[in-house]
């Protein structure tokens, strides 16, 4: 038993990487519990996370549907145990979030070089092609697969021996660049989508550098 | 096998309480919520509340706060529920019945035999 | 509360009939809607969940729809042993609700 009153939950906010999505609120619940409903502009409220504790909740299952809608959740406040609630009578408490367009708001994921080749003066860098929880027909889809040309990399490269970098860009997951013979280079990545207004790049991967595994080399 | 055993009939006096067990065996007790749902003689089904059992969070249906309680003991994977200042409308069969996986959360996959509470002067 | 408004409340049919039941939502509950079986004097037993999954082990016979607030249980031949009171249930808001039943006999 208890006095204390629900709170409406605060500070709705959406953190996504790559599609993989989770809604997470205030405040930590004292005599209180949550349940998640997330919908579409058009769409039905579909309940998610219930009679929750925790203060988060994870929507991926939901907005992998369709990537390209935009979300609204909100987090409904419950008293746990024989609490009052403060909502007027019969009408629950709840906030709503933001509104969430997954194709134009997930975080781009750290990237990773697959590998590198040399042949003679020229290196071929691979960036891996991760894959989604967005599905189709029952198979997960690539970041490439989902956003096609829209995804594109950015590529920083120096000599082993120098401060000085230089950068290339390519909408493929494969970037061919001019090399000095002799000479080992060290490289790394960003995804970037040249289109949107946030969230545009990705952090950067590790760097890999030749003569250390990942690549093949050809004289 | 994944089974939900009730305690006995009872048959209390108006304004009495009344506790009913409801032991689970043959699953991870802690991983599934329990609900607790009656049925008043020839009516249909009415939900009461439920209990997680891994922190003993309970909600209620308004219509019963401030009179139920629901309980768990983990040591036995047993949860209760306690009904206070009784009236004759809370004669019915009470049912515990688990909550479902992950998939389906508030679907009721396993019941209890239900206990039989009778109010009466 | 969601109101669940459970049609018809009693019928008669023919074994081998299909049998049809609704059940209408006060308002929209996506597909957080499960239908359950209970036979005098026992527990009742869950046969379909989120509107169309059928729980395991349930047969073939027995299935699920929707369309929009409305929810449709479908027995494609009805069987001696489906002689039962039906209900509905919905989730997706809170307090959890049932709907009144629809008790199915054999003519």
């Known amino acids: 038993s208890g006095t204390t009153n629900t709170v409406a939950a605060y500070n709705l906010t959406w953190k996504s990487t790559n599609f993989k999505t989770i809604l997470e609120w205030e405040p930590k619940p004292v005599n209180q519990v949550y349940t998640v409903q997330i919908s579409t502009k058009s769409g039905d409220w579909k309940s998610k996370c219930f009679y929750t504790t925790d203060t988060e909740c994870d929507l991926t299952d939901e907005i992998v549907k369709d990537v390209k809608q935009t979300y609204l959740a909100r987090v409904f406040s419950y008293p746990a145990g024989n609490v009052e609630s403060t909502g007027s009578a019969g009408e629950p408490l709840y906030e709503n979030s933001p509104e969430f367009t997954p194709y134009l708001e997930t975080n781009l994921g750290q990237p990773t070089i697959q590998s590198f080749e040399q042949v003679g003066t020229k290196v071929n860098v691979t960036v891996e092609d991760e894959r989604t929880l967005v599905r189709k027909n029952g198979t997960f889809l690539t970041l490439r697969q989902v956003f096609g040309n829209d995804l594109g990399y950015i590529l920083t490269y120096r000599k082993s021996s120098s401060s000085g970098k230089k950068t290339a860009k390519t909408n493929t997951n494969e970037f061919l660049i001019d090399v000095d013979k002799g000479e080992n280079y060290c490289f790394s990545v960003q995804a970037v989508i040249p289109s949107r207004t946030v969230n545009r790049k990705s952090t950067d991967s590790p760097v890999e550098c030749m003569g250390q595994e990942k690549g093949e080399f050809r004289e | 096998q994944v089974q939900l055993v009730q305690s006995g009939a009872e048959v209390k006096k108006p304004g009495a309480s009344v506790k009913v067990s409801c032991k689970a065996s043959g699953y991870t007790f802690a991983n599934y919520y329990m609900h607790w749902v009656r049925q008043a003689p020839g009516q249909g089904l009415e939900w009461m509340g439920i209990?997680?059992?891994?922190?003993?969070?309970?909600v209620y249906a308004q219509k019963f706060q401030g009179r139920v309680t629901m309980t768990r003991d983990t040591s036995t994977s047993t949860v209760y529920m306690e009904l206070s200042s009784l009236r004759s409308e809370d004669t019915a069969v009470y049912y515990c019945a688990r909550g479902g996986s992950k998939v389906a959360a508030l679907a009721f996959d396993i019941w209890g035999q239900g206990t039989m509470v009778t109010v009466s002067s | 509360d969601i109101q669940m408004t459970q049609s018809p409340s009693s019928l008669s049919a023919s074994v081998g009939d299909r049998v049809t039941i609704t059940c209408q939502a006060s308002q929209d509950i996506s597909n957080s809607l499960n239908w359950y079986q209970q036979k005098p004097g026992k527990a009742p037993k869950l046969l379909i969940y989120?509107?169309?999954n059928l729980e395991t082990g349930v047969p073939s016979r027995f299935s699920g729809s929707r369309s929009g607030t409305d929810f449709t249980f479908t027995i494609s031949s009805l069987q001696p042993e489906d002689i039962a009171t039906y209900y509905c249930?919905?989730?997706?808001?809170?307090?959890?609700?049932f709907g009144g039943g629809t008790k199915v006999e054999i003519k």
């Open positions: 989120d509107a169309s």
């Open positions: 209990i997680n059992p891994s922190g003993g969070i309970t």
């Open positions: 249930q919905q989730y997706n808001f809170h307090p959890l609700t």
